[in-house]
Interface confidence: low
């Protein structure tokens, strides 16, 4: 299709080389007054416009994204050629940063209802640059945490080094929806609830003598509880002796509850004590069996192919540890009688 009639928007993504970050493009079809070809629903001032209710469609996935190759080749369907770019409804998610994401991206409705709808499209010229060392060293992270029940703020990474007074007008989106009230480089949250979690996008306009473009950053915000002050506790095994049958296989499970920690490095391992010797056992990987906001339950099993007399003289010890401390639980095997 002919893209010469598409409205054009220029965006800049400056990514940090020292952190993982994502990026998004919205299929921002023009407002009705800008193009009579795009039949967008008119919104009352109180409604928050979503990207994008074009042609009365409720299905926001009715959008096709293309990339325009720089060598003049035909447009490429994003879904077929770029697995690191994911289309979620009408938003394009870039999962990995890199200058090779630079280029022209075009979106248009899949459903063409009249010959004129071909012009209902947006061309986004994306420039991707690594952050230079000269950029602010302490810029806000692209992953930010809010402590539940307390006051917090979400900072726009590309503007976090500027004072509020210097900051240009910022447009914020949360999970693809415009936050029409927010215009500064920080969103202040008086009391944090779990619904404050999500993907936030901040946009502001920069210009030089020739043109203007939108600088965009994406922030993943999670709501968390405070770091635990407790060492992990072992939920299983509870008993320190276990009745077993000689010659039979045996699996002993160690389940431990770890309180939430922002930097979470749980340790759960099995070792064997035999008289004055002690050694760690190579056992299957630990697995998380329950994860909540406040804690996580992790399980790790020790597997004996068959129980021997020697095993009855040993102690099997489960050892768990977090940044606060460690806990152990030992199990002595006892032959089942009768």
């Amino acid at each position: 299709f002919n893209i010469s009639g598409c409205s054009t928007k220029k965006l800049l993504w400056t990514y940090s080389t020292r952190s993982e970050e994502e990026f998004v493009l919205f299929c921002d079809l023009p407002e009705p007054q800008k193009s009579h070809f795009c039949h967008r629903n008119r919104l009352s001032p109180k409604q928050v416009p979503e990207h994008l209710p074009f042609m009365g469609s409720n299905d926001l996935s009715d959008v096709q994204w293309y990339q325009q190759p720089s060598n003049g080749d035909p447009l490429e369907d994003i879904r077929k050629s770029y697995p690191h770019i994911i289309q979620d409804k009408c938003t394009l998610h870039f999962l990995t940063p890199g200058v090779n994401n630079s280029g022209s991206y075009i979106c248009r409705p899949k459903m063409i209802k009249s010959p004129y709808d071909v012009a209902c499209c947006v061309k986004m010229i994306l420039e991707v640059k690594p952050q230079t060392n000269a950029s602010c060293e302490y810029s806000a992270s692209h992953k930010q945490d809010l402590l539940l029940g307390s006051t917090g703020s979400i900072s726009c990474p590309s503007l976090s080094c500027q004072s509020d007074a210097q900051s240009p007008a910022v447009t914020w989106y949360k999970n693809g929806k415009l936050l029409s009230v927010e215009r500064s480089n920080r969103i202040v949250v008086d009391e944090v609830y779990d619904y404050h979690q999500g993907t936030y996008v901040c946009d502001y306009t920069q210009s030089d003598t020739v043109s203007s473009w939108t600088v965009r950053a994406v922030v993943q915000v999670r709501t968390i509880v405070g770091d635990t002050k407790l060492k992990p506790d072992i939920l299983d095994p509870v008993e320190d002796t276990l009745e077993v049958e000689l010659g039979k296989p045996l699996t002993i499970s160690c389940k431990a509850r770890f309180g939430f920690e922002r930097v979470f490095n749980p340790v759960i391992k099995w070792y064997i004590k035999d008289s004055d010797l002690e050694w760690e056992v190579s056992v299957p990987e630990a697995k998380s069996i329950k994860s909540t906001l406040k804690d996580e339950i992790i399980e790790r099993n020790i597997i004996l192919e068959k129980v021997t007399q020697r095993d009855l003289r040993r102690k099997f010890v489960c050892f768990v540890q977090n940044s606060i401390g460690n806990t152990t639980q030992s199990v002595q095997l006892k032959e089942k009688r009768g």
Epitope: S61, R79, K80, P83, H84, I86, T96, N100
Partner: antibody, heavy 117, light 112 residues
Framework: SVEESGGRLVTPGGSLTLTCTAS????????MSWVRQAPGKGLEWIGF?????SAFYATWAKGRFTISKTSATVDLKVTSATTEDTATYFC???????????????WGPGTLVTVSS | AAVLTQTPSPVSAAVGGTVTISCQAS????????LAWYQQKPGQPPKLLIY???TVASGVPSRFKGSGSGTQFTLTISDLECDDAATYYC????????????FGGGTEVVVK
């Protein structure tokens, strides 16, 4: 196209590296998977590597199999080989079909690895 | 890890007939539709036939039809041709960091 190489006879406990070479498309644009097939048996997915170089594995393959990439090739390293690893190893390109996920749309002819003493 | 169970195997039918292969997943595939069918002939690599449960891959005849959702899927081959004799595999994607994909055990189709 995609082509695997490096298949050979290896003794139990040994290691080897298989290489997958892509031509006609860029590994910067596609994730790549390794799949194996023991003689007369079914297909078994080993793992895949993303365009950004991060690799993901089947539970059974973790530890002994390592997938890595350069700009032109994707490698599969097998360590502590056992006779169960005797198989034809395929490299497959993954194409993204939208929200539903990825599929293997282009396969190499495979390379045979035999583990025997 | 998810397990995909294919039935029956082998299955045979005459030229011009129809065969139906079933694939049962132990857990729902990603978005209920990350399921593909592959055809493999002896000495050859697999070939993608159907993806997204029912979308026929490029160059594949419309005689191949996929259906189902979630955990239960079916491949139907109608107007069987001699060239359809092969082993057919279903494969599910799970969008997870480990065990991202799983293959069914395969179903051999014999054309009489």
């Amino acid at each position: 196209s995609v082509e695997e190489s490096g298949g050979r006879l290896v003794t139990p406990g040994g290691s080897l590296t298989l290489t997958c070479t892509a031509s006609g498309f860029s590994l910067n644009n596609y994730h790549m998977s390794w799949v194996r097939q023991a003689p007369g048996k079914g297909l078994e997915w080993i793992g895949f590597i993303r365009t950004d170089g991060s690799a993901f594995y089947a539970t059974w393959a973790k530890g002994r199999f390592t997938i890595s990439k350069t700009s032109a090739t994707v490698d599969l390293k097998v360590t502590s080989a056992t006779t169960e690893d005797t198989a034809t190893y395929f490299c497959a390109r993954m194409f993204y079909a939208g929200d539903s996920g990825h599929y293997f749309d282009l396969w190499g002819p495979g390379t045979l690895v035999t583990v025997s003493s | 890890a998810a397990v995909l169970t294919q039935t029956p195997s082998p299955v045979s039918a005459a030229v011009g007939g129809t065969v139906t292969i079933s694939c049962q997943a132990s857990q729902s595939v990603h978005n209920n539709k990350n399921l593909a069918w592959y055809q493999q002939k002896p000495g050859q690599p697999p070939k993608l036939l159907i993806y997204d449960v029912s979308t026929v891959a490029s160059g594949v005849p419309s005689r191949f039809k996929g259906s189902g959702s979630g955990t239960q899927f079916t491949l139907t081959i109608s107007d069987l041709e001699c060239d359809d004799a092969a082993t057919y595999y279903c494969a599910g994607g799970y969008g997870s960091y480990t065990d991202t994909f799983a293959f069914g055990g395969g179903t051999e189709v014999v054309v009489k």
